[in-house]
């Protein structure tokens, strides 16, 4: 016999936010895996930037996406299959998963706030690495995306230590429409744009986990609910 | 060792075009930015253009633009430069030379190629 | 008119040291963009002789030194040599006019 009334509607709930958590970690999972395994971006492994050898930032920033879009797809599983089959057993691991996310999430958050400076120099270095490879290698598309999405995202282009070629290239190519270029420096400093997201809008990223923690306790709420619904439902 | 061997140039009149091709040698050509100098008769040198390496990007000067087409072709290592309505301030010799990411400048140079427009 | 400026010419006898200047502005060497001095001997194709301000490439010898300070670059020359005698051209890229600019060319010329 299956639930009924409210828990019918919690069950149907948890379904449908969990199909779309696995569909995002479907997505990311397999942008990551495009990313990682296209000969454009495999490139960037053997990148030089001048007489030094490329860092390894957007490799492990591919590694660290392909692990959230696995687990995501993974505990997005659990709860779709769980809440549809009714099963304490998935439900219990969902609920485990969850737990062990947050604790995580909130791990991660106290390491971000510590190494904010740490971070906002990768994402600077990442920036820098994507930049480079699409103008060194112009038939590398998504390295163009990479930069791009910086360029749109943040309102910015350049950086302030720019090559001639890349300056040319930014300026005829891969710059927003509009951008001015004062001097070397670019009107809008994507350098600067990323120190000012990780110092004077480091709320904006706290609020973004906040949501997520929320979603989770949400979930974690919602499961447990589920569960007992499932439990009592049995008995009778 | 690294080559380029500019040809194509001659007498031209004022109005005429002229296609300029330039061969290179000894370095992986399909891997590098190139681009195109001249120096008028006993004057200093000045960029015309550059494309990279897989012709997606590409820029001229000023006084080229919209006259010159720059263009290359990987399969046979040759850069080409394509000169309409050349006018009497063109003639120079012009230069083939390969352009260097990583030190950002012009790091070798053809022989060049004279191109005359005059009626 | 050059984008960077150069005295037309220069000279010296053989052994001594000669400095060729290179003055740009804020949008090009003052910028921070690199400058880099090219040897054209007469009747030949220009060749790199100092690239990102100071360094050489190889096989040219230690006697050319190349610095930057501001918006100017220099180019020196000591123990000059009679094959020394030639047009010099520092170059950089300009921001503001978005392209790869030339000085005027300096001829040096060395006596006795």
């Known amino acids: 016999m299956g639930v009924e009334g409210c828990t019918k509607c919690i069950k149907y709930l948890l379904f449908v936010f969990n199909f779309v958590f696995w569909l995002a970690g479907g997505v990311i999972l397999g942008v990551a895996l495009w990313l990682r395994h296209d000969p454009q971006t495999t490139n960037l492994l053997y990148l030089e930037l001048g007489d030094k050898p490329a860092p390894n930032t957007f490799y492990v920033g591919i590694y660290i996406l392909i692990a959230v879009g696995a687990v995501m797809m993974f505990v997005g599983f659990l709860g779709c299959y769980g809440a549809i089959q009714e099963s304490q057993c998935l439900l219990g691991t969902f609920f485990t998963c969850l737990v062990i996310l947050f604790a995580c999430e909130v791990a991660a958050g106290i390491w971000g706030f510590v190494n904010k400076d740490q971070i906002a120099k990768d994402v600077k270095q990442f920036y820098d690495q994507a930049l480079q490879q699409a103008v060194v290698d112009d038939d590398a598309n998504n390295a163009k995306a990479v930069v791009k999405t910086f360029h749109e995202t943040l309102d910015c282009c350049g950086s302030s230590t720019l090559t001639a070629i890349t300056t040319s290239v930014l300026k005829n190519n891969l710059c927003p429409s509009g951008s001015n270029i004062i001097s070397n420096l670019f009107k809008e400093d994507c350098h600067q744009k990323i120190d000012d997201l990780f110092s004077g809008k480091l709320y904006l990223i706290g609020i973004a986990a906040i949501v997520v923690a929320v979603i989770m306790i949400f979930e974690m709420i919602l499961s447990m609910v589920l569960c007992c619904g499932i439990r009592n439902s049995s008995v009778y | 060792e690294v080559q380029l061997l500019e040809s194509g140039g001659g007498l031209v009149q004022p109005g005429g075009s002229l296609r300029l091709s330039c061969a290179a040698s000894g370095f992986t050509f399909r891997s590098n930015y190139m681009s195109w100098v001249r120096q008028a008769p006993g004057k200093g040198l000045e960029w015309v253009s550059y494309?990279?390496?897989?012709?997606?990007?590409?820029d001229y000067a000023d006084s080229v633009k919209g006259r010159f087409t720059i263009s290359r072709d990987n399969s046979k290592n040759t850069l080409y430069l394509q000169m309409n309505s050349l006018r009497a301030e063109d003639t120079a010799v012009y230069y083939c030379?390969?352009?260097?990411?990583?030190?950002?400048?012009?790091?070798?140079w053809g022989q060049g190629t004279l191109v005359t427009v005059s009626s | 008119q050059s984008v960077l400026t150069q005295p037309p010419s220069a000279s010296g006898t053989p052994g001594q040291r000669v400095t060729i200047s290179c003055t740009g502005s804020t949008s090009n060497i003052g910028a921070g963009y690199d400058t880099h001095w090219y040897q054209q001997l007469p009747g030949t194709a220009p060749k790199l002789l100092i690239y990102?301000?100071?360094n050489r490439p190889s096989g040219v010898p230690d006697r050319f030194s190349g610095s930057k300070s501001g918006t100017s670059a220099s180019l020196a020359i000591s123990g000059l040599r009679s094959e020394d005698e030639a047009d010099y051209y520092c170059q950089s890229y300009d921001t503001n006019l978005s392209v790869w600019v030339f000085g005027g060319g300096t001829k040096l010329t060395v006596l006795g």
């Open positions: 030379a390969r352009y260097s990411y990583g030190r950002d400048n012009f790091d070798y």
């Open positions: 990102g301000n100071s």
């Open positions: 494309i990279s390496s897989s012709s997606t990007y590409t």
